[in-house]
Amino acid sequence: SEVEYRAEVGQNAYLPCFYTPAAPGNLVPVCWGKGACPVFECGNVVLRTDERDVNYWTSRYWLNGDFRKGDVSLTIENVTLADSGIYCCRIQIPGIMNDEKFNLKLVIKPAKVTPAPTLQRDFTAAFPRMLTTRGHGPAETQTLGSLPDINLTQISTLANELRDSRLANDLRDSGATIRIG
């Protein structure tokens, strides 16, 4: 039931996970672990936040987004084939059995030896690894795959060009989003 994300050896992998804090700065503890989410915890923890800050991390694992706004997406730097597998994002919402847990599958492919293609106007060609599975699986919201060769400006431009399409909606709404409060 997990959503699959892809990256190539040597690239940075991106595993999305989001929630909406009840109020600015009113953060929820989050943990990321290697392995599927166990019943209470996060598996082999690689990064953890508390109500204020990132309080534990290991090398190559970091939060690139603004976690104070609920973007707790994990970036894994310079991936190798050994980074393949299931990762757990657990949003530890206070209260009785309120935790939200997401299992994300990371597939690492060998690095391509051909030069990276230039950005094309054909959306499918430009996004060969994009997953458009929102709403089609057991997770409440499924998300887009890693797009390591394309920057955010290019994504925004393409989204504008295709704002009326289903793909653009998926792109805009991507992320496992939890609303708190």
Epitope: C31, P38, E41, N44, Q92, G95, I96, M97
Partner: antibody
Framework: EVQLVESGGGLVQPGGSLRLSCAAS????????MSWVRQAPGKGLEWVAA???????YFPDSVKGRFTISRDNAKNSLYLQMNSLRAEDTAVYYC?????????????WGQGTLVTVSS | DIVLTQSPATLSVSPGERATLSCRAS??????????MQWYQQKPGQAPRLLIY???NVESGVPARFSGSGSGTDFTLTISSLQSEDFAVYYC?????????FGGGTKVEIK
């Protein structure tokens, strides 16, 4: 050395309340899920509450709404507040540490404290 | 809830003999290739002690005569050659779902 020491047990009347404590030492308490497990006299084991490292709470239906679990990481302490106690809550209550990274099974246990609910 | 049924309720074994204890779950406890089943030993007046986790992993400090096996819904704890200190009650426990549940126990007694 990991140690878990329960206290607060005793005799209480039906409908009454009791608060159990568990003092933890020998490990980084804040990183672990913790649970309470009970054992009625001559009976088997029953899990009654858990709290994750992040503070999320878990209960079986048998105690939901009557029991609450809490932790004080600064004091390395775990608590079980038991309200509206019934005769069937009579048991030895164990504090148990969930295995790191999982929490769903227990690698260290306290010696237990006896709670007797009787009029 | 996942119901765990242990059998037999009582097992009479002579020291040095092999003991085989069974635990059956009302639904699968497989999760991403791992069987989320544990075994504990409890002696009178003592707290339980973790023996086996994830169906077949022997906890540190537990003698090698203890082993676990099984997957899905059927699990087995085997004590290859019973020692006097092994006479106790054994419980299985699942960590697949809340509520966490234990089996009713198997008492291993001296024959």
């Amino acid at each position: 050395e990991v140690q878990l020491v329960e206290s607060g047990g005793g005799l209480v009347q039906p409908g009454g309340s009791l608060r159990l404590s568990c003092a933890a030492s020998g490990f980084t308490f804040s990183r672990y899920a913790m649970s309470w497990v009970r054992q009625a006299p001559g009976k088997g084991l029953e899990w009654v509450a858990a709290i994750s490292s992040g503070g999320s709470l878990y209960f079986p239906d048998s105690v939901k709404g009557r029991f609450t679990i809490s932790r004080d990481n600064a004091k390395n302490s775990l608590y079980l507040q038991m309200n509206s106690l019934r005769a069937e809550d009579t048991a030895v209550y164990y504090c148990a540490r969930g295995r790191e990274a999982d929490g769903g099974y227990f690698d260290y246990w306290g010696q237990g404290t006896l709670v007797t609910v009787s009029s | 809830d996942i119901v765990l049924t242990q059998s037999p309720a009582t097992l009479s074994v002579s020291p040095g003999e092999r003991a085989t204890l069974s635990c059956r779950a009302s639904e699968s406890v497989e999760y991403y290739g791992t069987s989320l089943m544990q075994w504990y030993q409890q002696k009178p007046g003592q707290a339980p002690r973790l023996l086996i986790y994830a169906a077949s992993n022997v906890e540190s400090g537990v003698p090698a005569r203890f082993s676990g096996s099984g997957s899905g819904t059927d699990f087995t704890l085997t004590i290859s050659s019973l020692q006097s200190e092994d006479f106790a009650v054994y419980y299985c426990q699942q960590s697949m779902k809340v509520p966490l549940t234990f089996g009713g126990g198997t008492k291993v007694e001296i024959k």
